[in-house]
């Protein structure tokens, strides 16, 4: 259950999709990827206050226990709920190849 | 790819499965769950240093960008990779029912 999408901390402060521009050097890919040379990395960033975009029952439990034992149990964390595919042109021993990665760029976020 | 399981921060400091004892009151379930009255909640807790139990390519990217932009990009987070089912005896309008929850207790952890 995707619980409340209203962020009590203020607009843009809670778990959501962000885009971060990164070069191949930034990603540590410069020696095996040829294209694209700049990646618009979509990732999940932001706080997960009580019941905000709770992914499942486990996230709800975590929220409850974090409230009780904040030093022991961390708050839920903002992570990808799904991914977008991305195609890379890679170097190979014989030349180049196109490879699709299905777990590289976040499409949607939730708290868990 | 489940990367290195060696924790560079010392034994037990990195992302792993922990068990937290919780009552129905702790969980906010006292008014709808009859049994069990105490739950051994298994959850994922711990740090996610570089490439430790990286769940996928996205986790690897996140590690790289966190190193470059620690104020913008958070480190990967320790979350369940899979769940164990749990059966609850619940109150219903007509009496009680057994309900299985598949997303309640963490079984295995990774960093994402």
């Amino acid at each position: 259950a995707r619980n409340g999408d209203h962020c009590p901390l203020g607009p843009g402060r809670c778990c959501r999709l962000h885009t971060v521009r990164a070069s191949l050097e930034d990603l540590g890919w410069a020696d095996w990827v040829l294209s694209p040379r700049e990646v618009q990395v979509t990732m999940c960033i932001g706080a997960c206050p009580s019941q905000f975009r709770a992914a499942n029952m486990h996230a709800q439990i975590k929220t409850s226990l974090h409230r009780l034992k904040p030093d022991t149990v961390p708050a839920p964390c903002c992570v990808p709920a799904s991914y977008n595919p991305m195609v890379l042109i890679q170097k190979t021993d014989t030349g180049v190849s196109l490879q699709t990665y299905d777990d590289l760029l976040a499409k949607d976020c939730h708290c868990i | 790819a489940r990367n290195g399981d060696h924790c560079p921060l010392g034994p037990g400091r990195c992302c792993r499965l922990h068990t937290v004892r919780a009552s129905l009151e702790d969980l906010g379930w006292a008014d709808w769950v009859l049994s069990p009255r105490e739950v051994q909640v298994t959850m994922c807790i711990g740090a996610c240093p570089s490439q430790f139990r990286a769940a996928n390519m996205h986790a690897q990217i996140k590690t790289s960008l966190h190193r470059l932009k620690p104020d913008t990009v958070p480190a990967p987070c320790c979350v369940p990779a899979s769940y164990n089912p749990m059966v609850l005896i619940q109150k219903t309008d007509t009496g009680v029912s057994l309900q299985t929850y598949d997303d309640l207790l963490a079984k295995d952890c990774h960093c994402i």
Partner: antibody, heavy 119, light 112 residues
Amino acid sequence: QVQLVQSGAEVKKPGASVKVSCKASGYPFEGWYIHWVRQAPGQGLEWMGWNNPRTGLTNHAQKFQGRVTMTRDTSISTAYMELSRLRSDDTAVYYCARGVGADAAFDIWGQGTMVTVSS
Amino acid sequence: EIVLTQSPATLSLSPGERATLSCRSSQSLLWKHGYNYLDWYQQKPGQAPRLLIYLDRNRAHGIPARFSGSGSGTDFTLTISSLEPEDFAVYYCMQSFETPITFGQGTKVEIK
């Protein structure tokens, strides 16, 4: 199969706007960039810009600054290119094409949309 | 912006002959690992362009072996080892080394 299908030919008056659509099928729309290229009658190819369907971010040639808008609707795997304040020298065939990024070759092209600007 | 100059403007040859098309760049298109951000396209009347060669020397999917690309830095060549009747068309080189992406003015390969 993998293809890009564009909207039909348009005839516009100078000063008007035109919006060309490009529907992708047979591949994950958000995994590839959409580029726009035009070709005036009897002339060569001219790159206009790109749209990253994953993020909605765009980039275009300086020549089209303030006149071109590139958008997308991921729910129907369609990219759009709108050109405003049309002039007679905008008469051309407009193509969409896909590439793995901003700097990649265009491996699949739409069939082209003829836009005629005439008073 | 990078200017690409193709020569000759027109090439008159017979089927079975070898075609050599040139593309010269106003600046180097060489990136790391010895790859150049130069591609070749074929266009027939009333049709969209078709990718032949990408990253200076890699044949696109389904392109016959008689097409080959070579060169580095600022000077590039597309070679058609033995012209088939369907090869008579206009050929464009394109650079994606930097924005704006630019094309050469084209070389028309016509039947002698």
